[in-house]
């Protein structure tokens, strides 16, 4: 098959409103530059400065800088996954790329040309994938996870996930890997999604799917997009394995009732 499982509806991070900002600790006293925390973070933290190690899951590089593997890095993908990139001058990166790239192709070939490729700066939209950082002493976020609901980081052990409730019964879930397989598919999807959200440089504006799970890790019968202001989110009904049930949807004008199904 072309793919394994679906992402489902989009759930965006909570806005950085006054309540969220009130929960922030004071920003570090000595900082060359303050930037927002990675992921859904609303609070301010120190930007990484030129020459500091960086990667997909570390804090952001400062303005005008871009995280890149060192030029002589034999395993550039691995370097970024492991937080062994370096914050370098973004314009220098562009100049180097222009120097290294072949001449632009002839007109008519442009649709798949090198020139069409987005340069993917640190400000590009993203939600990341492979979470690991080699050396905790270089990466203060090594033992933290982004909390979606309140938009701030919470201490946890190694990569043990600390969930907060987001209309999902996550509080009683243990994240120990030995117990993980005892839970249903919704729980596994949620944990994998939250793993994606750890140690991010930036947040995808398209958001991330956080499914609505019951305590056993199966899908609750009613799944909804979040409300947008006064506009109610789109809702639909699923079975315990997350498969949508035909005929049970609402465009927001009226509530959807998911009858004769598993636990809500």
């Amino acid at each position: 098959g072309a793919s394994s499982a679906g992402l489902g509806p989009v759930v965006r991070c909570e806005p950085c409103d006054a309540r969220a900002l009130a929960q922030c600790a004071p920003p570090p006293a000595v900082c060359a530059e303050l930037v927002r925390e990675p992921g859904c973070g609303c609070c301010l933290t120190c930007a990484l400065s030129e020459g500091q190690p960086c990667g997909i899951y570390t804090e952001r590089c400062g303005s005008g800088l871009r995280c890149q593997p060192s030029p002589d890095e034999a395993r550039p993908l691995q370097a970024l996954l492991d937080g062994r990139g370096l914050c370098v001058n973004a314009s220098a990166v562009s100049r180097l790329r222009a120097y290294l790239l072949p001449a632009p192709p002839a007109p008519g070939n442009a649709s798949e040309s090198e020139e069409d490729r987005s340069a993917g700066s640190v400000e590009s939209p993203s939600v990341s994938s492979t979470h690991r950082v080699s050396d905790p002493k270089f990466h203060p976020l090594h033992s933290k996870i982004i909390i979606i609901k309140k938009g701030h980081a919470k201490d946890s052990q190694r990569y043990k996930v600390d969930y907060e409730s987001q209309s999902t019964d996550t509080q009683n879930f243990s994240s120990e890997s030995k117990r993980e397989t005892e839970y249903g598919p919704c729980r596994r999807e949620m944990e994998d999604t939250l793993n994606h959200l750890k140690f991010l440089n930036v947040l995808s504006p398209r958001g991330v799917h956080i499914p609505n799970c019951d305590k056993k890790g199966f899908y609750k019968k009613k799944q909804c997009r979040p409300s947008k202001g006064r506009k109610r989110g789109f809702c639909w009904c699923v079975d315990k394995y997350g498969q949508p049930l035909p005929g049970y949807t609402t465009k927001g004008k009226e509530d959807v009732h998911c009858y004769s199904m598993q636990s809500k």
């Epitope: 997909i56 993908l77 994938s129 979470h131 793993n195």
Partner: antibody
Framework: QVQLQQSGAEVKKPGSSVKVSCKAS????????TSWVRQAPGQGLEWMGG????????EYAQKLEGRVTITVDESTNTAYMELSSLRFEDTAVYYC???????????WGQGTLVTVSS | EIVLTQSPLSLPVTPGEPASISCRSS???????????LNWYLQKPGQSPQLLIY???RRASGVPDRFSGSGSGTDFTLKISRVEAEDVGVYYC?????????FGQGTKVETK
């Protein structure tokens, strides 16, 4: 529903190049490692290389270095794999795959058969 | 690069019976964060591979609980508690610890 949709089968002559596309839909693209994996007839899986669009960073398997180029167009969420100086032994099904949360390929394209024949 | 060696290469199975596949790595796949970066895939005839197990023991979404993974360091095992007819195909282990990511040679599982 996350889907990786690949371009159609190709028949190429030895020494020529082929460019296969992989369009991602329904999910997030920018910081996943989009990889290319190939499978010769009756053989196993071989990782060819990958790209992280957000960092515009690529890495290739050593045996293919210099012949393979992986690029992306983030505006269309499409990854491309170009293989040059084709040889008979490059005849294979080429898959694009997205590395998920913990260095595993959670989504695969349907595969593109590239036949190198004179 | 890390070399993965699977055994057996061919495994005739009887539906309802258990089955086991081994994957040995040329170096430890245990990361300093405590995770073993070893994944298992099943490629059914004529299809793309599909993820079964990641991080040595975590079942991917939608994978039946008859599949389980175990092991740490260099030795890993995929077990099927009760083989079903739909489980036939080629099983691959893959390491995601370091690039280049590499696969085992594959184990062909077919019914007797």
């Amino acid at each position: 529903q996350v889907q990786l949709q690949q371009s159609g089968a190709e028949v190429k002559k030895p020494g020529s190049s082929v460019k296969v596309s992989c369009k991602a839909s329904g999910g997030i693209f920018s910081t996943y490692v989009t990889s290319w994996v190939r499978q010769a007839p009756g053989q196993g899986l071989e990782w060819m290389g990958g790209i992280i669009p957000m960092f515009d960073t690529t890495e290739y398997a050593q045996k293919l270095e210099g012949r393979v180029t992986i690029t992306v167009d983030e505006s269309t969420n499409t990854a491309y794999m170009e293989l040059s100086s084709l040889r008979f032994e490059d005849t294979a099904v080429y898959y694009c795959a997205r590395a998920g949360g913990l260095s595993h390929f959670d989504y695969w394209g349907q595969g593109t058969l590239v036949t190198v024949s004179s | 690069e890390i070399v993965l060696t699977q055994s057996p290469l061919s495994l005739p199975v009887t539906p309802g019976e258990p089955a086991s596949i081994s994957c040995r790595s040329s170096q430890s796949l245990l990361h300093s964060n405590g995770n073993n970066y070893l994944n298992w895939y099943l490629q059914k005839p004529g299809q793309s591979p599909q993820l079964l197990i990641y991080l040595s023991s975590r079942r991917a979404s939608g994978v039946p609980d008859r599949f389980s993974g175990s092991g740490s360091g260099t030795d890993f095992t995929l077990k099927i508690s009760r083989v079903e007819a739909e489980d036939v195909g080629v099983y691959y282990c893959m390491q995601g610890l370091q690039t280049p990511w590499t696969f085992g040679q594959g184990t062909k599982v077919e019914t007797k």
